[in-house]
């Protein structure tokens, strides 16, 4: 967190806290995490630590939703102090605050080893894609706390962290929505999301990521009681994730190839595709399913897994080369990602310096193409579109905040994958 002028305060998830102020953080998809205490320190940093629970000297300790530690029945607070939390309704079923459940059909890009985990918190439903660990037994069982099946005997304790861990401020909420778009899913071995596993429905312990823990990506979307999809758009009965693009399907015309719609949070934004005025061949041809004409028989130089037409267009959008340079020295990694543009003819270079997983420095430079040509070690990694670059820079802004206060091992590598364009299926993008 940056210290702002003379009056020091902390910013945490878009809220201001005074120095010395304490609170329980609100972390999606868990809601208020009562087992974590946060405090705003004098230098404007948020320090959070897990609550250490005292040993309970009774046979049947009771878990109370708004208290972290289990209590003996005789030491419970009076009933009138009880916090009444709103329940949630989803798909005709009512869920209590803190309850976890499984949903289907929310994420179009769900992998076979992923499931959709939802939780009810303060009247809102939070859902995430959860990558399940590889199962090492023949007959896995379902558990109430997770949409993943587990081997008998696994899972109960493995999700616990040691008490009293200190961790730095997690990124603000948006940081965990935006850059894990529908364009890719990091491989299960990668830790890409801000949060890892879901804790038990009764205990919020273990809700925060341990960088050593092998677990999957969480991509949250938010659904409120009225079934509105938070980070998704619905068009013509189809659900699209934030950042996903499609050609609209209009009843009278069918699929309109010359219009490209993009899901921006919950709004769909559509724009007309502009075809090139001049082609490098005399007789460009119209092809079914493509908006712009293409030159026959001339294939653009293809990069693995990508298809561009002759002018380096992808789904009607111009593509630009992306270069990368990674340099390691004295335990410090400098990663440079560069986008070359034609108008203006220049190169935008994003420079990341990371030491021991913590972001030391991040900045953006613009230099001329001539200057860029002087620089060694840059390798062409892909071509991308301006809209993908925009998604990349938004995600980058978020993880640059996140990774300056906690260890990030693969976040940037995973984010770079946003720039890779999927091979377009015949007929639509």
């Amino acid at each position: 967190e940056q210290v702002k002028h003379s009056e020091t305060y902390c910013m945490f998830q878009d809220k201001k806290y005074r120095v010395g102020e304490r609170w329980h953080p609100y972390l999606e998809p868990y809601g208020l995490v009562y087992c974590v205490n946060c405090i705003c320190s004098e230098n404007g940093n948020v320090l959070c630590s897990r609550v250490r629970c005292p040993n309970v000297h009774c046979l049947s300790p009771v878990h109370i939703p708004h208290l972290c530690c289990p209590r003996c029945p005789d030491s419970l607070p009076p009933v009138n102090n009880k916090v009444t939390s709103k329940s949630c309704e989803y798909n005709g079923t009512t869920y209590q605050h803190g309850e976890l459940f499984v949903a289907e059909g929310l994420f179009q890009n769900r992998q076979p080893n992923q499931c959709t985990q939802c939780s009810c918190s303060e009247g809102n439903v939070y859902c995430g894609l959860k990558t399940c660990p590889k199962l090492t037994c023949a007959f896995p069982v379902s558990v109430p706390d997770s949409c993943c099946r587990v081997c008998r005997g696994d899972g109960e304790l493995s999700w616990e962290h040691s008490d009293g861990d200190i961790f730095r401020q997690p990124a603000n909420r948006e940081a965990r929505h935006s850059y894990h778009r529908s364009h890719y899913d990091p491989p299960p071995s990668r830790q890409a999301g801000g949060l890892s596993r879901f804790p038990g429905a009764r205990s919020h312990r273990g809700a925060l990521m341990d960088s050593q823990q092998a677990s999957g990506t969480i991509v949250q979307i938010v659904i409120n009681n009225k079934h509105k999809h938070g980070q998704v758009c619905v068009s013509n009965g189809k659900t699209y994730s934030h950042g996903e693009s499609w050609h609209p399907n209009l009843r009278a015309f069918g699929i309109v190839e010359c219009v490209l719609c993009t899901c921006n949070v919950t709004k769909q934004e559509c724009k007309k595709i502009h075809c090139p005025n001049r082609y490098p061949c005399k007789y460009p041809q119209k092809i079914d399913g493509k908006c712009c004409k293409v030159c026959p028989g001339k294939k653009a130089k293809e990069l693995p897994g990508q298809s561009f037409d002759n002018k380096g267009y992808f789904c009607g959008e111009e593509t630009m080369p992306v270069y990368e340079s990674v340099f390691m020295e004295d335990g410090e990694t400098t990663r440079k990602i560069a986008l070359e543009t034609e108008r203006p003819p220049q190169v935008e270079v994003h420079v990341w310096t990371i030491r021991k997983g913590i972001l030391q420095h991040f900045h953006i430079e613009k230099i001329s193409k001539r200057m860029f040509e002087e620089l060694p070690h840059f390798k062409l990694v892909t071509r991308t579109t301006l809209s993908q670059w925009k998604i990349f820079t938004e995600g980058e802004a978020q993880i640059s905040q996140m990774c300056s206060s906690r260890v990030c091992r693969t976040e940037l590598e995973d984010l770079v994958k946003v720039l890779y364009l999927e091979r377009s299926e015949k007929g639509h993008c």
């Epitope: 340099f327 270079v349 430079e365 200057m371 060694p376």
Partner: antibody, heavy 121, light 107 residues
Framework: QVQLVQSGAEVKKPGASVKVSCKAS????????MHWVRQAPGQGLERMGN????????NYNEKFKSRVTMTVDKSSSTAYMELSSLRSEDTAVYYC??????????????WGQGTLVTVSS | DIQMTQSPSSLSASVGDRVTITCRAS??????LAWYQQKPGKAPKLLIY???SLEDGVPSRFSGSGSGTDFTLTISSLQPEDFATYYC?????????FGQGTKLEIK
């Protein structure tokens, strides 16, 4: 600490060549660009070119391209700049300068003390 | 080549004064600009890079601002050791080019 130590002053005749050295210490020599900048008496600064000490790759200012040669000796962490076909207008102080590592634009954070080259018949 | 024009070419000021030197590029160089200080018989010293980033070890009375074509170096309260010549340099395109310098003298 980072230091760039240059060779001493030289007096040359027109048409001759001069070779200026710049010995680097206090950092990993091969990890930073080395640039050469000159300054004629009472004049401004002019970059002549640079060399990548890790592979010897060079970039020369068009103005000097035909006459300048930049080299490095990795074993002694020394960079060299040789200027040939000297003329009187080449009389200047020649500096070697290292550029900041984590920036793609060239910002010179450490400079040698300078070597005065006088071209006179 | 990109031309860099500094103004004024010289100025007189007193200790404690606030001083501003400007630098104009002949085309858009975004933030790719550095400021150097040079004292007689010495090598230049980097003060500001990337238009507004203060180099390590440089006193905080020095600051840089601007982007595009117009840039400013400000010394908030002149100290005796600040009397020197100041150069701007564009690092956006090759060849790199320097301004002609601004000589800051004691009034």
């Amino acid at each position: 600490q980072v230091q760039l130590v240059q060779s001493g002053a030289e007096v040359k005749k027109p048409g001759a060549s001069v070779k200026v050295s710049c010995k680097a210490s206090g950092y990993t020599f091969t990890s930073y660009w080395m640039h050469w900048v000159r300054q004629a008496p009472g004049q401004g600064l002019e970059r002549m070119g640079n060399i990548n000490p890790s592979n010897g790759g060079t970039n020369y200012n068009e103005k000097f391209k035909s006459r300048v040669t930049m080299t490095v000796d990795k074993s002694s962490s020394t960079a060299y700049m040789e200027l040939s076909s000297l003329r009187s207008e080449d009389t200047a102080v020649y500096y070697c300068a290292r550029s900041k590592n984590n920036y793609v634009a060239y910002y010179f954070d450490y400079w040698g003390q300078g070597t005065l080259v006088t071209v006179s018949s | 080549d990109i031309q860099m024009t500094q103004s004024p070419s010289s100025l007189s000021a007193s200790v404690g004064d606030r001083v501003t030197i400007t630098c104009r590029a002949s085309e858009n160089i975004y933030y790719s600009l550095a400021w150097y200080q040079q004292k007689p018989g010495k090598a230049p010293k980097l003060l500001i890079y990337n238009a507004n980033s203060l180099e390590d070890g440089v006193p905080s009375r020095f600051s840089g601002s601007g982007s595009g074509t117009d840039f400013t170096l400000t010394i908030s309260s002149l100290q005796p050791e600040d009397f020197a010549t100041y150069y701007c340099k564009q690092a956006y395109d090759v060849p790199l080019t320097f301004g002609q310098g601004t000589k800051l003298e004691i009034k």
